[in-house]
């Protein structure tokens, strides 16, 4: 058993049929010694008396809010949560496996630049009685500070018969140099509590590996005289690290119709303009990627050919 | 320590081409190592990230773009003295700061070159003959060093009398390649910045 936060404790249980469970001793936070009784949740049934209560925690029915009282007055609470371990593996029931970039990916994180600011998100089908808390650091043995905000519900989607909820959190490394060469990864830890179930999820990464620039901005087309070619120009996104001559991007320019199966024109360039063949009912799209360290491409920025 | 903006005339920057070749060569070598040593811990997640130049050179700080010198997190620079007679910029306007940056890059390359050559000598003794260093990568390191054209003491190649542990050598190769790739990215950024200034 360990303390998650004040008056909230996590009991780690090996979860299998007829498991013996864990013996837990609760102590009432009071100077009083006599006349103390214990109850669980809203029940008025007295579970025991005395300053300490010993219980055998085996299942969710044994978890919950234990309260010690004296003469009708509440002295203190202890909330017990369960953390299940099945076949030596901690349960991951609360969050959905996003399977990208590999299986057992519950947390996904992205950074728009090298400033040390990043966003992580996760998915769940649970809509109520759900809380998250996020901690992060650079390195684990001698951790350096990363400050994370509160996790918020950022999107709701319908997937077949189920509703899916996306939560996200923004974090900022306390003293980040965009030009630094990372040798210690960022660690992100998410505590998830659903009703009386506790789970924790972690992710470890270098900012350089989760870079995904914003799409290029200000796409403009200039038809070339006596030609079917069009000069398309754009600018670096505002959110990208500066100076751009140091933090350079490379671009992919594509002309395609509405269907992905349609024919296309595609060219890669390090410049902020390119010449392509425009077709009726097609769009010109441009996306960006770090020129020197190939992490993710940005989303497309698009303009119609016409 | 930072790069001032007053720099060379356009087209006078032969190092940019060499640095691009360097990044390409080390990336290819790292990819080859990951594929060949698939049953060794050779991915970014599996290895310890060591920097053999730590406390010996300070390329990131010495080559910091002027725009980032206002960022206090970038300025915990280590004091290191460097030779300052580089010819890569082919311009008399080469400032002291820039020479410091380029000589730091030169020292990085020299240290990695020695490590890689020592390691290759060990790998050539491996009866499995599983992996060797790409001669192209070694040649590209040499070309960039020549373009930088700093005079510095030659570091003797480390020779070891004991029987090499090939497993450890291959893991060290992965660690070195990952670190060198990251440094090659920095070098490419620096050269691009100087070329544009």
């Amino acid at each position: 058993i360990w303390e998650l936060k004040k008056d909230v404790y996590v009991v780690e249980l090996d979860w299998y049929p007829d498991a013996p469970g864990e013996m837990v001793v609760l102590t009432c936070d009071t100077p009083e010694e006599d006349g103390i009784t214990w109850t669980l949740d809203q029940s008025s049934e007295v579970l025991g008396s005395g300053k300490t209560l010993t219980i055998q925690v085996k299942e969710f029915g044994d978890a919950g809010q234990y309260t010690c009282h004296k003469g009708g007055e509440v002295l203190s609470h202890s909330l017990l949560l369960l953390h299940k371990k099945e076949d030596g593996i901690w349960s991951t029931d609360i969050l959905k496996d996003q399977k990208e970039p590999k299986n057992k990916t519950f947390l996904r994180c992205e950074a728009k630049n090298y400033s040390g600011r990043f966003t992580c998100w996760w998915l769940t089908t649970i809509s109520t009685d759900l809380t998250f808390s996020v901690k992060s650091s650079r390195g684990s043995s001698d951790p350096q500070g990363v400050t994370c905000g509160a996790a918020t519900l950022s999107a709701e989607r319908v997937r077949g018969d189920n509703k899916e909820y996306e939560y996200s959190v923004e974090c900022q490394e306390d003293s980040a140099c965009p030009a630094a060469e990372e040798s210690l990864p960022i660690e992100v830890m998410v505590d998830a509590v659903h009703k009386l179930k506790y789970e924790n999820y972690t992710s470890s990464f270098f900012i350089r590996d989760i870079i995904k620039p914003d799409p290029p901005k200000n796409l403009q087309l200039k038809p070339l005289k006596n030609s079917r070619q069009v000069e398309v120009s754009w600018e670096y996104p505002d959110t990208w690290s500066t100076p751009h001559s140091y933090f350079s991007l490379t671009f992919c320019v594509q002309v395609q119709g509405k269907s992905k199966r349609e024919k296309k024109d595609r060219v890669f360039t390090d410049k902020t303009s390119a010449t392509v063949i425009c077709r009726k009912n097609a769009s010109i799209s441009v996306r960006a990627q770090d020129r020197y360290y190939s992490s993710s491409w940005s989303e497309w920025a698009s303009v119609p050919c016409s | 320590r930072n790069l001032p903006v007053a720099t060379p005339d356009p087209g006078m920057f032969p190092c940019l081409h060499h640095s691009q070749n360097l990044l390409r060569a080390v990336s290819n070598m790292l990819q080859k190592a990951r594929q060949t040593l698939e049953f060794y811990p050779c991915t970014s997640e599996e290895i310890d990230h060591e920097d053999i130049t730590k406390d010996k050179t300070s390329t990131v700080e010495a080559c910091l773009p002027l725009e980032l010198t206002k960022n206090e997190s970038c300025l915990n620079s280590r004091e290191t003295s460097f030779i300052t007679n580089g010819s890569c910029l082919a311009s008399r306007k080469t400032s002291f700061m820039m020479a410091l940056c380029l000589s730091s890059i030169y020292e990085d390359l020299k240290m990695y070159q020695v490590e890689f050559k020592t390691m290759n000598a060990k790998l050539l003794m491996d009866p499995k003959r599983q992996i060797f260093l790409d001669q192209n990568m070694l040649a590209v390191i040499d070309e960039l060093m020549q373009a930088l054209n700093f005079n510095s003491e030659t570091v003797p190649q480390k020779s070891s009398l004991e029987e090499p542990d090939f497993y450890k050598t291959k893991i060290k190769l992965c660690i070195l390649l990952h670190a060198f790739r990251i440094r090659a990215v920095t070098i490419d950024r620096v050269m691009s910045y100087l070329n544009a200034s």
Epitope: K263, R266, D270, T275 | -
Partner: antibody
Framework: QVQLVQSGAEVKKPGSSVKVSCKAS????????LHWVRQAPGQGLEWMGW????????EYAPKFQGRVTITADESTSTAYMELSSLRSEDTAVYYC???????????WGQGTLVTVSS | DIVMTQSPLSLPVTPGEPASISCRAS??????LHWYQQKPGQAPRLLIY???QSISGVPSRFSGSGSGTDFTLTISSLQPEDFATYYC?????????FGQGTKVEIK
């Protein structure tokens, strides 16, 4: 299976014209860009131009501009390349080729040898 | 026009040995570079597109690398069926241009 079948070999006199055909099968004709590339005996590949059969748009290499005409007939899934004012150095194998991507080629015809000789 | 220069023009290789062909562009072309194989009396066949992207059905011993002006096609272990002429082609701008070809011959 996408296939491009070209017309047979031709022998032409200098100053005349040649029209080579290329019939496509497998896939929708207008879903692909069609290119013409030639190869002189023992020499390398030389790109001549492309056509978008959907709208008839064409682009020619400056070297052939004014001498080459590429057309397409959607109803028969056939493309044509006509080269005029032939000279002996136009002796080559002419390939039609296609791809959904405009700038490189993934399916080639078998080639048509055009010999220009007096 | 962008001029593509291949080297060497002839490459004698022992079967089972690796081979590398270089292609240089007269100006920077990013990764707009494609490789083809041509055997005598046959049409060319696409091997690699956009410098390093492999084609399904092409053996994994063929790999491409490079960007900017310098590109390499590598065959990790030459098989008897790989003896052919190899061409690079740039697609950075029109007109599309090819290298002059490299003939890989049995040593």
């Amino acid at each position: 299976q996408v296939q491009l079948v070209q017309s047979g070999a031709e022998v032409k006199k200098p100053g005349s014209s040649v029209k080579v055909s290329c019939k496509a099968s497998g896939g929708t004709f207008s879903d692909y860009y069609l290119h013409w590339v030639r190869q002189a005996p023992g020499q390398g590949l030389e790109w001549m131009g492309w056509i978008d059969p959907e709208n008839g748009d064409t682009e020619y290499a400056p070297k052939f501009q004014g001498r080459v005409t590429i057309t397409a007939d959607e109803s028969t899934s056939t493309a044509y390349m006509e080269l005029s004012s032939l000279r002996s150095e136009d002796t080559a194998v002419y390939y039609c080729a296609r791809n959904k991507e405009l700038r490189y080629i993934d399916v080639w015809g078998q080639g048509t040898l055009v010999t220009v000789s007096s | 026009d962008i001029v593509m220069t291949q080297s060497p023009l002839s490459l004698p290789v022992t079967p089972g040995e690796p081979a590398s062909i270089s292609c240089r562009a007269s100006q920077s072309i990013s990764i707009n570079l494609h490789w083809y194989q041509q055997k005598p009396g046959q049409a060319p066949r696409l091997l690699i597109y956009f410098a390093s992207q492999s084609i399904s059905g092409v053996p994994s011993r063929f790999s491409g690398s490079g960007s900017g002006t310098d590109f390499t096609l590598t065959i990790s272990s030459l098989q008897p069926e790989d003896f052919a002429t190899y061409y690079c082609q740039q697609s950075n701008s029109f007109p599309l241009t090819f290298g002059q070809g490299t003939k890989v011959e049995i040593k």
